[in-house]
Interface confidence: low
C-alpha cells in the first residue's frame, strides 16, 4: 500500500492531524523534500548573522556574517570576529603575532615563519607579522662576496601567544 504522504511535494507537509492531507508549510518554515511529516523552522539570521538568502517554502534561509566577522562551521553556523593581518584572535581579543610568526589573513592563527635553512636555502626577505619570510637560493649558489639578509631568530612554537 502506497504511503499517502509520499504524494506531498516539497513546500508542504503530510498533516497527520488532518487525515494526512498535504498542507502548505506555515509561514517561516520550509520542507526541502517531498513526503515530510513536518516542516522545519526557517533559520533566522539575527544579531551578527546577516541574511544571504531568504527562506522559502522549499529551502532554508542562508546566513553569512556582518562586516567585521567571518563564517565558521558548516552552513555558517558560527560567526567569528575578524582581526587585522598580523594578528590572531584570542580570548582577550585580537593580539599581534609573536615574533617569528605571521598571519596574512583576517582570520586564523599566527603560523611560524618558514625555516629556510631546513631546505638549505637562505633568507631573501625577512618575515614580518603579516608576511612569511621569502627564501632565496641556497648559500652555496650565491656568488662569492654576495651577501644574504641575516636569517631571522628561530620562530617560537605556535600556541604561545598571550591568552
Amino acid at each position: 500500500l502506497q504511503d499517502p504522504c509520499s504524494n506531498c511535494p516539497a513546500g508542504t507537509f503530510c498533516d497527520n492531524n488532518r487525515n494526512q492531507i498535504c498542507s502548505p508549510c506555515p509561514p517561516n518554515s520550509f520542507s526541502s523534500a517531498g513526503g515530510q511529516r513536518t516542516c522545519d523552522i526557517c533559520r533566522q539570521c539575527k544579531g551578527v548573522f546577516r541574511t544571504r538568502k531568504e527562506c522559502s517554502s522549499t529551502s532554508n534561509a542562508e546566513c553569512d556574517c556582518t562586516p567585521g566577522f567571518h563564517c565558521l562551521g558548516a552552513g555558517c553556523s558560527m560567526c567569528e570576529q575578524d582581526c587585522k593581518q598580523g594578528q590572531e584572535l584570542t580570548k582577550k581579543g585580537c593580539k599581534d603575532c609573536c615574533f617569528g610568526t605571521f598571519n596574512d589573513q583576517k582570520r586564523g592563527i599566527c603560523r611560524p615563519w618558514t625555516n629556510c635553512s631546513l631546505d638549505g636555502k637562505s633568507v631573501l626577505v625577512n618575515g614580518t607579522k603579516e608576511r612569511d619570510v621569502v627564501c632565496g637560493p641556497s648559500p652555496a649558489d650565491l656568488s662569492p662576496g654576495a651577501s644574504s639578509v641575516t636569517p631571522p631568530a628561530p620562530a617560537r612554537e605556535p600556541g604561545h601567544s598571550p591568552q
Epitope: 533566522q44 551578527v48 562551521g73 558548516a74 552552513g75 584572535l89 592563527i109 612554537e157
Partner: antibody, heavy 121, light 107 residues
Framework: QVQLVQSGAEVKKPGSSVKLSCKAS????????INWVKQAPGQGLEWIGN????????NYNQKFKDKATLTVDKSTSTAYMELSSLRSEDTAVYYC??????????????WGQGTTLTVSS | DIQMTQSPSSLSASLGERVTITCKAS??????LSWFQQKPGKAPKTLIY???RLVDGVPSRFSGSGSGQDYTLTISSLQPEDIATYYC?????????FGGGTKLEIK
C-alpha cells in the same frame, strides 16, 4: 563567576518523557550557545545539539533529532532538553556546556555538573 | 559526520614519564580540535583548544600539536593528578564529534 547548574537525577519508565534543565548565571545568557552532551555508562561523549538563546536557533546531531528537543527560557536564563520515547539506551549522564557566539574557540569552556537519567521498568 | 579515531584506548605509564595520545580525523579539520580531561564522576574539563593552545590555568606539562587530520596530546611528565580519561573533539564541522577516549592509569 560563570555557573551552569543542572537539574537533579531522574528515574523514568520506558516510553515516557523527561525535561532536563540547565540554569546559567554569571554571564550574558543570550551571547552563548548552550550545547548538550550525552555520556552513557562507561562510554564516551556524544554531542546532541545546541541552541542559541537569543533567537532559539538550534542545531541537532541527526542521531538525536527525533529524541531531543532543545528550548530556552530567557527570563530565567535556563536551557531545557526534553527527551521523548525513553528507552534503556537513553540511560546516561547528560551535560550542558556553553560556546560563545563570536569566538569559535571558546568551545565547551564551562560545563554543568551533569544530570543522571536512568530509564528502567 | 567526521570520525575521530583516538589511540590508545587505554594506557599505563609511570609517574614522571612522557605520555602521548593521538587522534586522527577522517578529514582535514583545520586545527579545530580540543582535548578534554575527565575524572570519574566529574564533568569534562577543557585542556587545549585550536590543537595547541593551552586553556588558562592548565599546567604547562600538557601540550597539543598537529594539523590536517593528525593530532597529539602530550603530558611531558606524568603526575598523580593526571590520572583520568582524555578525549579529543573536532569542531570544524557540525556535529562536533569526540574521539573514543583514552583511559590513563599509573603503572
Amino acid at each position: 563567576q560563570v555557573q551552569l547548574v543542572q537539574s537533579g537525577a531522574e528515574v523514568k519508565k520506558p516510553g515516557s518523557s523527561v525535561k532536563l534543565s540547565c540554569k546559567a548565571s554569571g554571564y550574558t545568557f543570550s551571547s552563548y550557545w548552550i550545547n548538550w552532551v550525552k555520556q552513557a555508562p562507561g562510554q564516551g561523549l556524544e554531542w546532541i545539539g545546541n541552541i542559541y538563546p537569543s533567537d532559539s536557533y538550534t542545531n541537532y546531531n541527526q542521531k538525536f533529532k527525533d529524541k531531543a528537543t532543545l528550548t530556552v527560557d530567557k527570563s530565567t536564563s535556563t536551557a531545557y532538553m526534553e527527551l521523548s520515547s525513553l528507552r534503556s539506551e537513553d540511560t546516561a549522564v547528560y551535560y550542558c556546556t556553553r560556546t560563545w557566539e563570536f569566538y569559535y574557540d571558546s568551545v565547551f569552556d564551562y560545563w554543568g555538573q551533569g544530570t543522571t537519567l536512568t530509564v528502567s521498568s | 559526520d567526521i570520525q575521530m579515531t583516538q589511540s590508545p584506548s587505554s594506557l599505563s605509564a609511570s609517574l614522571g614519564e612522557r605520555v602521548t595520545i593521538t587522534c586522527k580525523a577522517s578529514q582535514d579539520i583545520n586545527s579545530y580540535l580540543s582535548w578534554f580531561q575527565q575524572k570519574p564522576g566529574k564533568a569534562p574539563k577543557t585542556l587545549i583548544y585550536r590543537a595547541n593552545r593551552l586553556v588558562d590555568g592548565v599546567p604547562s606539562r600538557f601540550s597539543g600539536s598537529g594539523s590536517g587530520q593528525d593530532y597529539t596530546l602530550t603530558i611531558s611528565s606524568l603526575q598523580p593528578e593526571d590520572i583520568a580519561t582524555y578525549y579529543c573533539l573536532q569542531y570544524d564541522e557540525l556535529p562536533p564529534t569526540f574521539g573514543g577516549g583514552t583511559k590513563l592509569e599509573i603503572k
